[in-house]
């Protein structure tokens, strides 16, 4: 019972984690304009892995995709790759773990096979979580480096009198979503690996004993009795998260209480 609970909980935690990783990857707010100690602007900038956005105080929001691939920083490409690898591994892990769940019976699948599948999905979840954490951490490190570089020359003089304000970026909501989601996926993976140990059929410490009777011989070999319902589960490939990508690049978002900073 404890094994089933551990496996089930591991699956649910990983599912939430992977949904979070997908959400973080799709979010636009990986980095947001730093408003502390900055001249108050009537525009607010924020950036994601796929596009950068500007929200004006009028409520108008404009987003522009990064339409170049070669022109993007290598670090950004690396973060994208890590997040996508994390999502792909997580998705495969979810698919495998569905069939590995103890509460689901598929034909006469052996417990050893379920144990192996549970271990496989667990490892996939762990790697997926690590990919997400690594991706988010690389991006965060990139932000910190750029932040202090831009702080060093916050105001770059242009022709003596004219000043150009450099926009500084700080951690966006997506980073925190990514860290938490990666952590959840990692925890879920560990739980699956723990559940795997409980699923594996235990080796018996005693040998099979032969009883020789006169006339004919019968050998008794103690072993686990396996019962199967024989019902195949009708598992459906559910959509875990809808990124909600807008088709329009420009949207009029109504003023909110955060419009003025």
């Amino acid at each position: 019972m404890a094994v089933t609970a551990c496996q089930g909980l591991g699956f649910v935690v990983s599912l939430i984690g992977i949904a979070g990783i997908i959400a973080a990857t799709c979010m636009d707010q990986w980095s947001t304009q730093d408003l502390y100690n900055n001249p108050v602007t009537a525009v607010f900038n924020y950036q994601g892995l796929w596009r950068s956005c500007v929200r004006e105080s009028s409520g108008f929001t404009e987003c522009r995709g990064y339409f170049t691939l070669l022109g993007l920083p290598a670090m950004l490409q690396a973060v994208r790759a890590l997040m996508i690898v994390g999502i792909v591994l997580g998705a495969i892990g979810l698919l495998v773990s569905i069939f590995a769940l103890k509460c689901i019976r598929i034909g006469s699948m052996e417990d050893s096979a379920k144990a192996n599948m549970t271990l496989t999905s667990g490892i996939m979840f762990i790697v997926s979580g690590l990919c997400a954490i690594a991706g988010v951490s690389v991006f965060a490190n990139m932000l910190v480096t750029n932040f202090w570089m831009s702080t060093a020359n916050m105001y770059t003089g242009m022709g003596g009198m004219v000043q150009t304000v450099q926009t500084r970026y700080t951690f966006g909501a997506a980073l925190f979503v990514g860290w938490v989601a990666g952590g959840l996926t990692l925890i879920g993976g560990v739980m699956m690996c723990i559940a795997c140990r409980g699923l594996a059929p235990e080796e018996t410490n005693y040998k099979a004993v032969s009883y020789h009777a006169s006339g004919h011989s019968v050998a008794y070999k103690p072993g686990g009795f396996k019962a199967s319902t024989g019902f195949g589960s009708n598992t459906k490939n559910k959509k875990i998260y809808d990124g909600g990508a807008r088709t329009e690049d420009e949207v009029q978002s109504y003023p909110s209480k955060h419009d003025y900073v």
Epitope: V43, N45, V162, T164, Q252, D259
Partner: antibody, heavy 118, light 113 residues
Framework: EVQLQQSGREVVRPGTSVKVSCKPS????????IDWVKQRPGQGLEWIGG????????VYNEKFKAKATLTADKSSMTTNMQLSSLTSDDSAVYFC???????????WGQGTLVTVSA | DIVMTQSPSSLTVRAGEKVTMTCKSS????????????LTWYQQKPGQPPKLLLY???ARESGVPDRFTGSGSGTDFTLSISSVQAEDLAVYYC?????????FGAGTKLEIK
């Protein structure tokens, strides 16, 4: 058609206060910010501040913070500007305007002339 | 506060001529996030409220004749009227819409000979 209808001209005594109103029509009242601009006779334009009619949040020009108070009434769909401790320097035409894309002001009220006279 | 300097303060031209007026800001109005300049141009005719001509320094407001064009980036901006008409008699203001407080230039008065 978008319109911003302002209240009529006001002649007030120094030291008193006055409330100028602006009633927008032709669009959803809470969807756009309303800004207020001052213009002294024969002079240029000065931005006083803006209000988000949906949330009531305001932003002011520091110069007018002690002078002007911006409010919005969703029930009557009106934005108001209260000017206090009036002096002759406050004699001007006050405009309300709708803030749109590019943070620009696309529709303006006809203006309210406030005259501070003893 | 951002200082907006307009020049000339006034100019007189004949109908049909091309006219150019400039606006300088004390700080760059360019936003790298969307590659736009947050500068607006208005036209104010005598006894009327200002009318929006251009936003984002170059984007023409709907209904504005195409003889009005804006150019420039960062701190230096220009408003050009390709062929001045009698109805263009007005004061033209530029406005910083990037930094608070939003500030206007002193204006350029256009007069027709």
């Amino acid at each position: 058609e978008v319109q911003l209808q302002q209240s009529g001209r006001e002649v007030v005594r120094p030291g008193t206060s006055v409330k100028v109103s602006c009633k927008p029509s032709g669009y959803a009242f809470t969807n756009y910010l309303i800004d207020w601009v001052k213009q002294r006779p024969g002079q240029g334009l000065e931005w006083i501040g803006g209000i988000n009619p949906g949330s009531g949040d305001t932003v002011y020009n520091e110069k007018f913070k002690a002078k002007a108070t911006l409010t919005a009434d969703k029930s009557s769909m009106t934005t108001n500007m209260q000017l206090s401790s009036l002096t002759s320097d406050d004699s001007a035409v006050y405009f309300c305007a709708r803030r749109v894309r590019g943070n620009s002001f696309d529709s303006w009220g006809q203006g309210t002339l406030v005259t501070v006279s003893a | 506060d951002i200082v907006m300097t307009q020049s000339p303060s006034s100019l007189t031209v004949r109908a049909g001529e091309k006219v150019t007026m400039t606006c300088k800001s004390s700080q760059s109005l360019f936003n790298s996030g969307n590659q736009r300049n947050y500068l607006t141009w208005y036209q104010q005719k005598p006894g009327q409220p200002p009318k929006l001509l251009l936003y984002w320094a170059t984007a023409r407001e709907s209904g504005v004749p195409d003889r009005f064009t804006g150019s420039g980036s960062g701190t230096d901006f220009t408003l050009s009227i390709s062929s001045v008409q009698a109805e263009d008699l007005a004061v033209y203001y530029c406005q910083n819409v990037y930094f608070y407080p939003l500030t206007f230039g002193a204006g350029t008065k256009l007069e027709i000979k």
